[in-house]
Interface confidence: low
């Protein structure tokens, strides 16, 4: 396994609708054909997998149908969007990139993007 540099923004604020987007960029040391991207969430020293997708370079990322993630790729950049976030989902979201094919296998893990999610204030009752 060879190491690879992965860059991602330090902080992202989710929208009022609970959507957060960030770019995960990797320094490919060769001509990868197949890439796997995994988003991990670290909170309270626990790391859990949020979503993962394997894609051919130049193709759309295909996450599972019930995934909260969507994404697109452009060269060595992956644009990731996580939906359905609530305040309790605030945490460090780490981008993990693996160059799956052809060999050699490369692995890169970003430093993480701190995503802050603020639940919207409920609308006050109105007679109108």
């Amino acid at each position: 396994c060879k190491a690879m540099h992965v860059a991602q923004p330090a902080v992202v604020l989710a929208s009022s609708r609970g959507i957060a987007s960030f770019v995960c960029e990797y320094a490919s040391p060769g001509k990868a054909t197949e890439v796997r991207v995994t988003v991990l969430r670290q909170a309270d020293s626990q790391v859990t997998e949020v979503c993962a997708a394997t894609y051919m370079m130049g193709n759309e990322l295909t996450f599972l149908d019930d995934s909260i993630c969507t994404g697109t790729s452009s060269g060595n950049q992956v644009n990731l969007t996580i939906q359905g976030l609530r305040a309790m989902d605030t945490g460090l979201y780490i981008c993990k990139v693996e160059l799956m094919y052809p060999p050699p296998y490369y692995l890169g893990i970003g430093n993480g993007t701190q995503i802050y999610v603020i639940d919207p204030e409920p609308c006050p009752d109105s007679d109108f």
Partner: antibody, heavy 124, light 113 residues
Framework: EVQLVESGGGLVQPGGSLRLSCAAS????????IHWVRQAPGKGLEWIGI????????NYAQKFQGRVTISRDNSKNTLYLQLNSLRAEDTAVYYC?????????????????WGQGTLVTVSS | DIQLTQSPSSLSASVGDRVTITCRAS??????????LAWYQQKPGKAPKLLIY???NRATGIPSRFSGSGSGTDFTLTISSLQPEDFATYYC???????????FGQGTKVEIK
Amino acid sequence: EVQLVESGGGLVQPGGSLRLSCAASGFTFSDYAIHWVRQAPGKGLEWIGIISPSSGSTNYAQKFQGRVTISRDNSKNTLYLQLNSLRAEDTAVYYCARDIHSGSSGYYYGFDVWGQGTLVTVSS
Amino acid sequence: DIQLTQSPSSLSASVGDRVTITCRASESVDFFGISFLAWYQQKPGKAPKLLIYDASNRATGIPSRFSGSGSGTDFTLTISSLQPEDFATYYCQHYTSSPPVYTFGQGTKVEIK
């Protein structure tokens, strides 16, 4: 012996479909990406598409997009090519070919093992 | 997409001759110091056979009379001393990623003079 053997060729009506198979032996099939390449009579080589080793991700040449499907069954060491809406210009010998990879120092590439090819004739 | 142009499209040569085939790419095929260009030999009625990969590396079992050179956009396949079994058609091929595309040159037919 490392080999690929194509089958399923023959005469197909215009507008019809073909499904070709490529049986692999002598190597660990699930470790390699495999390609389909075709060659019209008296013409050059034309790349159709690639399927990756384990996930089965695919990519196709622009001219075949929407008309071709490549799939694989690693448990059967077999690769498949489905080509739809056939026309006369799809008449060709269809080859499957293994993607070379070697060592840990770089992304060496090339098609190092080829099948013998299977002839598909599209005619009414 | 990158286009590959081979020259000549055909040539006549004798056994023992030194033969050179060129392949020109419409833009550089180099990436991280590697030229992603391969050469194949094809005989009538047979599947292509890999000769050279990464512009200059001989594939397993290929005789030393075959050599590849070049970088960037200009590449050469040389057969130092043509043998009877070398009369065939030769193709260059380039690989690019994002998305993966594999492009072949139009071929060069080497015939007996």
